[in-house]
Interface confidence: medium
């Protein structure tokens, strides 16, 4: 046990206030009562402590709460949160969305730090699922949050939470993630009418199967090329030229510009050249006339 320096006469802190910024580190250690600090944490954020002084304050809280801080303290950590390590945060039990918001606010405008990632992980695990309010909050601070989750983690997202998702939240999602999210979105938006449904489901279509794309092609949705290019290749390949034409509507013109890129390139290779020619776009690479097309997947299923 290190011998502690005594607090100089008249310097014992009676409250957490601006006068403490003039204290040396050893004076803060000796003169600030940890329990007082814990009850007046909200004041710390309004005082321009140096990083070294904040280290002392953190040390005092660590001594007071070796098993992890209570939520009443966590909610008011403010800038002191930036001093916490992921190991510190793993000891916490954060259940209030207000606490989560308060700490995310401190880190606002910065990349998601390991501390924030650990905090979010603890919070979501504590709740058992990623509910709508939590998802709303997290995507407001970190638009890429949803796409940072594994498909396994995404499986805990209830369909009702999908209403909180904005198109930009899915920008960096890969096909495996969209495979998980799409069925949830389909369920969430099932009671909407045609055009409204398409607006909502559009961002999730990278996880849609062929039969759903075929169904959409019957609804005059006029899918834009950017959305089409994000569709699963295996879902696009079975679509006929007529179905793609209906699906894209006036945007079908854009196929020419994308004919060398997936999934358009692979889709062209599966179509009869005669059928492609009906589009009048000059798409080349289809199956020449007179050739027989064998659906090998069907053949394997029969044998």
């Amino acid at each position: 046990e290190v011998e502690k320096t005594a607090c100089p006469s008249g310097k014992k802190a009676r409250e957490i206030d601006e006068s403490l910024i003039f204290y040396k580190k050893w004076e803060l250690e000796a003169c600030v009562d940890a329990a007082l600090l814990a009850t007046q944490m909200d004041r710390v954020n309004a005082i321009p402590f140096t990083y070294e002084q904040l280290d002392v304050l953190k040390h005092k809280l660590d001594e007071l709460y070796p098993q992890g801080y209570p939520e009443s303290v966590i909610q008011h950590l403010g800038y002191l949160f930036l001093k916490m390590s992921p190991e510190d945060i793993r000891k916490w039990n954060v259940t209030s969305l207000e606490t989560l918001k308060a700490l995310l606010e401190v880190n606002k405008g910065h990349e998601m730090s390991p501390q924030v990632a650990t905090l979010i992980d603890r919070f979501v695990k504590g709740r058992g699922q990623l509910d709508k309010d939590t998802l709303d909050t997290l995507t407001a601070f970190y638009p890429g949050y949803l796409c940072s989750l594994s498909p396994e983690e995404l499986s805990s997202v209830p369909p009702s939470s999908i209403w909180a998702v904005r198109p930009q939240d899915l920008d960096t999602c890969d096909p495996r993630q969209l495979d998980v999210l799409y069925p949830k979105a389909r369920l969430a938006f099932q009671n909407m009418n045609g055009s409204e449904y398409f607006v909502k489901i559009q961002s999730f279509l990278g996880g849609a199967p062929t039969e759903d794309l075929k169904a959409l092609s019957q609804q005059n949705v006029s899918m834009d090329l950017a959305t089409f290019m994000k569709l699963r290749t295996d879902a696009v390949l079975p679509l006929t030229v007529a179905e793609v034409q209906k699906l894209l509507g006036p945007h079908v013109e854009g196929l020419k510009a994308e004919e060398r890129h997936r999934p358009v390139r692979d889709w062209i290779l599966r179509q009869r050249q005669d059928d492609l020619d009906t589009l009048g776009l000059g798409l080349q690479g289809g199956i020449p006339n007179g050739y027989l097309v064998l659906d090998l997947s069907m053949q394997e299923a029969l044998s």
């Epitope: 601006e18 309004a46 005082i47 321009p48 401190v106």
Partner: nanobody, 115 residues
Framework: QVQLVESGGGLVQPGGSLRLSCAAS????????MRWYRQAPGKGLEYIAG???????YYADSVKGRFTISRDNSKNTLYLQMNSLRAEDTAVYYC?????????WGQGTQVTVSS
């Protein structure tokens, strides 16, 4: 968003006085502590004085007894009355506050103490 604009700086002789003002773009009634810092040529930022919303004041030892901080909530303005000025008080003086985890600073006002 809080905009802070300092004024009142200038050239003054040693022993003279100046009064700096810091006008805020929003009501300072709800803002907690407001502060004055200064930065002398080639030096770091130095905390000079602070005043909480309840009127409690704090001063660095270097200005204690010579400078007085005050605020007028009705005018959304913070003041720094500087008396018995010395050559070492020459610096750019900045007004500062923290609100919603954002640090807000004014553009600064130059104070030069010279004979």
């Amino acid at each position: 968003q809080v905009q802070l604009v300092e004024s009142g700086g200038g050239l003054v002789q040693p022993g003279g006085s100046l009064r700096l003002s810091c006008a805020a773009s929003t009501s300072i009634f709800s803002i907690g502590t407001m502060r004055w810092y200064r930065q002398a040529p080639g030096k770091g930022l130095e905390y000079i004085a602070g005043m909480t919303s309840d009127g409690t004041t704090y001063y660095a030892d270097s200005v204690k007894g010579r400078f007085t901080i005050s605020r007028d909530n009705s005018k959304n303005t913070l003041y720094l009355q500087m008396n018995s000025l010395r050559a070492e008080d020459t610096a750019v003086y900045y007004c500062n506050t923290v609100a919603h985890f954002q640090n807000y600073w004014g553009q600064g006002t130059q104070v030069t103490v010279s004979s």
